[in-house]
């Protein structure tokens, strides 16, 4: 039986490319400029298949000597993209993927950009900026987000099954009602995960059953009514 | 796209039996189950019972079921709903319902008069 | 059988107000749940379904939310089309029960 009777999806993908920024303007500039200082890393989750921009430092570029932007990728060599300010040049090192560039020419705007997010890109990103004050940094611990694809089926008697397709990190599924469930994960290569809830409802007045699927991405729920048990007799009159 | 189509009206006598058609268009008839529901003039909405065309098996609330019969002909993907011993408690609209109530039929009014 | 507690049962309010109902389920069931809108002579329009996801083609000024056993449906900003009775629909249990009805006026 297709999930929510007659193809009743219950979330809506959107799938414009979508663009994430830490990036602040001038005015949070400087209202926050030794907070953000301080702060050195940030822990970020970004969607998959969005584009990203990470920033460096709030430091004005005439007071710049180099920028140094740092990309630790899993199973990878560290890249590195760096402009130095008094000569105008730019430098790259082992650094291989196309989708990481500035975002403009480095001598008008220091950021770093990811189109179109991998999951490749998992990974560490830092900028430090070399001034006369000394260096300042500031490190991504970026996380990639993959919404999982969500099913829901009734395999036999008063059992359903949902499933949270490669998702990552890990899906949480729950049901209306609570049921006798089992769950299983399974760890692909890629670092997404699948998760597979199986419930069945002894309890016969349950007519329809929900799947609610939780994830950083956002949540989704599917329902379906339970299909009578084969050979069942029509309710006595 | 999915429809359900009903009469619009009935006339019956009181102690008189009357059959109340939906007729499915647009999905798998036999993988869904049909309900039925129940409205009183200027009243909420009750549910008499569901079937499930692939299988025939049916249920129903409590209270309507010495009054309401269900059946399908698979053949014209037609569910039926009869109602005996009619009173004027049983004049309503009956309306047939699919997809867990996201299709609806136009609803057939029932009159129970002399 | 689960019963279900809509209030109000008729509320009054001007073009433009935000107007919320609440469907409560008995004994603390956890079920699901979906809001119709009915208007005279016509069968019920299905507005939200699984508590909170919007139908497609209803406007996004109808909402819905659950708190536990707690569903609530909101009208954003009201418009004079949006004058019917409301029914919560819980379908999670045999047999399916509705709320009594939320009759929305426009002042």
């Known amino acids: 039986q297709p999930n929510n009777s007659l193809m009743l999806q219950t979330s809506k993908e959107n799938h414009a490319l979508a663009s994430s920024s830490l990036c602040m303007d001038e005015k949070q500039i400087t209202q926050n400029y030794s907070k953000v200082l301080a702060e050195v890393n940030t822990s970020w989750p970004v969607k998959m298949a969005t584009n990203a921009v990470l920033c460096c430092p709030p430091i004005a570029l005439r007071n710049l000597i180099i920028i140094t932007w740092e990309i630790i990728l899993r199973g990878q060599p560290s890249c590195t993209k760096a402009y130095k300010k008094e000569t105008n040049e730019t430098k790259e090192t082992n650094c291989t993927d196309e989708r990481i560039t500035w975002v403009s020419r480095p001598d008008q705007n220091s950021d770093l950009q990811i189109r179109t997010v991998a999951i490749t890109h998992d990974g560490y990103y830092r900028c430090i900026m070399v001034t006369p004050d000394g260096n300042f940094h500031r490190g991504y611990h970026l996380q990639v987000l993959v919404t999982p694809e969500v099913t829901l089926f009734q395999n036999r008697n008063r059992t359903a099954v949902c499933k949270a397709v490669a998702g990552k990190p890990a899906a949480h599924i729950s049901w209306i009602p609570e049921g006798d469930c089992a769950t299983k994960q399974e760890y692909w290569s890629n670092g997404t995960v699948t998760v597979k809830s199986t419930c069945h409802w002894e309890v016969h007045n349950v007519s329809t059953v929900t799947c609610h699927v939780s994830h950083l991405t956002g949540n989704k729920s599917l329902y379906i009514e339970l299909l009578p048990v084969p050979g069942a007799k029509k309710s006595a009159k | 796209q999915v429809q359900l189509q009903q009469p619009g009206s009935e006339l019956v006598r009181p102690g008189a039996s009357v059959k109340l058609s939906c007729k499915a268009s647009?999905?798998?008839?036999?993988?869904?189950?049909m309900h039925w529901v129940k409205q009183r003039p200027g009243q909420g909405l009750e549910w008499i019972g569901n079937?499930?065309?692939?299988?025939?098996?049916?249920n129903y609330d409590e209270k309507f079921k010495s009054k309401a019969t269900l059946t399908v002909d698979t053949s014209s993907s037609t569910a039926y709903m009869q109602i005996s011993s009619l009173t004027s408690e049983d004049s309503a609209v009956y309306y047939c319902?699919?997809?867990?109530?996201?299709?609806w039929g136009q609803g057939t009014l029932v009159t129970v008069s002399a | 059988d689960v019963q279900m507690i809509q209030s109000p049962s008729s509320l009054s309010a001007s073009l433009g107000d935000i107007v919320t109902m609440t469907c409560q389920a008995s004994?603390?069931?956890?079920?699901?749940l979906n809001w119709f809108q009915q208007k005279p002579g016509k069968a019920p329009k299905l507005l939200i379904y699984?508590?909170?996801n919007l139908e497609d083609g209803v406007p996004s000024r109808f909402s819905g939310s659950r708190y536990g056993t707690d569903f609530t449906l909101t009208v954003s900003s009201l418009e004079d089309e949006d004058m019917a009775t409301y029914f919560c629909?819980?379908?999670?249990?045999?047999?399916?029960?509705f709320g009594g009805g939320t009759k929305l006026e426009i002042k």
């Open positions: 319902t699919t997809g867990t109530s996201t299709y």
């Open positions: 647009g999905y798998t008839f036999t993988s869904y189950w």
């Open positions: 079937i499930y065309p692939g299988s025939g098996t049916t």
């Open positions: 004994q603390g069931t956890s079920i699901n």
């Open positions: 699984g508590a909170v």
């Open positions: 629909l819980q379908h999670t249990y045999l047999p399916w029960t």
